[in-house]
C-alpha cells in the first residue's frame, strides 16, 4: 500500500485511550491510538477560547 | 496551501465497486490521520474510516465494515476508499479530510481542520 | 460507540444575536469534542476544537466550552454569514461520532 512503517509501536485497543510513548515532534492521538505529528498548542492566559493561532504559545494550561 | 481533492465518484448499481482517491498538497499525509465521512442527500455527517499512513492502521465504521477498505500510498500523498458491495444507503458526498493534532501533555487535541470538495457516490440500478 | 446528541435540531435567528448550541456526549470524553460549520453544497470547517479552542482564522464571536458530557457553542453576535448548520464531534474514541447537527436559519 506504500504505507511506510516508521517506528514500532503499540496498537492499542479500540477502548484504551493510554497513551504510548511518543517522540518529541509527536503526540498520542487517542482517536487512532498512535502517535501522530504534533503541532505547538496554544493556551490563552485566560484559559478560555482564543483567538491566537495555534502555536503561539507552548504550555497548556490543563490536560485534554 | 495544504489541499484535498477527491475523486472518483459516480454512479454505480448496488453490489457495484467504486475507488475513490484523496490527493494531497501541501503537507505529508504520512504524518497525519486521513478520515472518510460521508453525507446523504440533506442528512448529517457520518465518518466512515480513517487511516494513519505512517504506520499503515486503519479502522471503518460498522456500516461499512467488510465492504469498504480504506489506505494510502505515501509516495503519492494521495489516501483511497475501495467500496465494493455497494448498497443504495451508501449513497452520499464522501468527503476526505485531514485530522490536525496540537500538543497538549503528549495528547492529540484536533479536529479535522481541511476538507477536500467532496465527490457524489450515487448507488442506483 | 459514544452518541452526540446536538440540541435544538434548528433554530430562527437574527443578524446580531446571541446563539448557543448544545452537545450532549452519552460518556465522558474529556475535552475531545470539535466543533464544525457547513454551508449547502460545501465541506465543513473547523471552528473549535479541544472543547474550547479557537482555530485558525475564525472569528472571535464563536466559543466553545464544557467537558465531560455537555458542551457549548456561542456565537456571540450572529452575523449573516453565520446561517448555516453547525456540528459537534468527539473524537476520544473511534468511531468519531457526530451530532445531528444545528441548522441556524435567518427570522
Known amino acids: 500500500m506504500g504505507a511506510r512503517r516508521l517506528r514500532v509501536r503499540s496498537q492499542r485497543s479500540r477502548d484504551s485511550s493510554v497513551p504510548t510513548q511518543c517522540n518529541q515532534t509527536e503526540c498520542f492521538d487517542p482517536l487512532v491510538r498512535n502517535c501522530v505529528s504534533c503541532e505547538l498548542f496554544h493556551t490563552p492566559d485566560t484559559g478560555h477560547t482564543s483567538s491566537l493561532e495555534p502555536g503561539t504559545a507552548l504550555q497548556p494550561q490543563e490536560g485534554s | 496551501e495544504v489541499q484535498l481533492v477527491e475523486s472518483g465518484g459516480g454512479l454505480v448499481q448496488p453490489g457495484g465497486s467504486l475507488r475513490l482517491s484523496c490527493a494531497a498538497s501541501?503537507?505529508?499525509?504520512?504524518?497525519?490521520?486521513i478520515h472518510w465521512v460521508r453525507q446523504a442527500p440533506g442528512k448529517g455527517l457520518e465518518w466512515v474510516a480513517w487511516?494513519?499512513?505512517?504506520?499503515?492502521?486503519?479502522d471503518y465504521a460498522d456500516s461499512v465494515k467488510g465492504r469498504f477498505t480504506i489506505s494510502a500510498d505515501t509516495s503519492k500523498n494521495t489516501a483511497y476508499l475501495q467500496m465494493n458491495s455497494l448498497r443504495a444507503e451508501d449513497t452520499a458526498v464522501y468527503y476526505c479530510a485531514r485530522r490536525v493534532c496540537y500538543n497538549r501533555l503528549g495528547v492529540c487535541a484536533g479536529g479535522m481542520d481541511y476538507w477536500g470538495q467532496g465527490t457524489l457516490v450515487t448507488v442506483s440500478s | 460507540d459514544i452518541q452526540m446528541t446536538q440540541s435544538p435540531s434548528s433554530l430562527s435567528a437574527s443578524v446580531g444575536d446571541r446563539v448557543t448550541i448544545t452537545c450532549r456526549a452519552s460518556?465522558?470524553?474529556?475535552?475531545?469534542v470539535a466543533w464544525y460549520q457547513q454551508k449547502p453544497g460545501k465541506a465543513p470547517k473547523l471552528l473549535i476544537y479541544s472543547a474550547s479552542f479557537l482555530y485558525s482564522g475564525v472569528p472571535s464571536r464563536f466559543s466553545g466550552s464544557g467537558s465531560g458530557t455537555d458542551f457549548t457553542l456561542t456565537i456571540s453576535s450572529l452575523q449573516p454569514e453565520d446561517f448555516a448548520t453547525y456540528y459537534c464531534q468527539q473524537s476520544l474514541m473511534t468511531p468519531p461520532t457526530f451530532g445531528q447537527g444545528t441548522k441556524v436559519e435567518i427570522k
Open positions: 501541501g503537507f505529508t499525509i504520512s504524518s497525519n490521520s
Open positions: 487511516v494513519t499512513p505512517g504506520v499503515g492502521s486503519t
Open positions: 460518556q465522558d470524553v474529556s475535552t475531545a
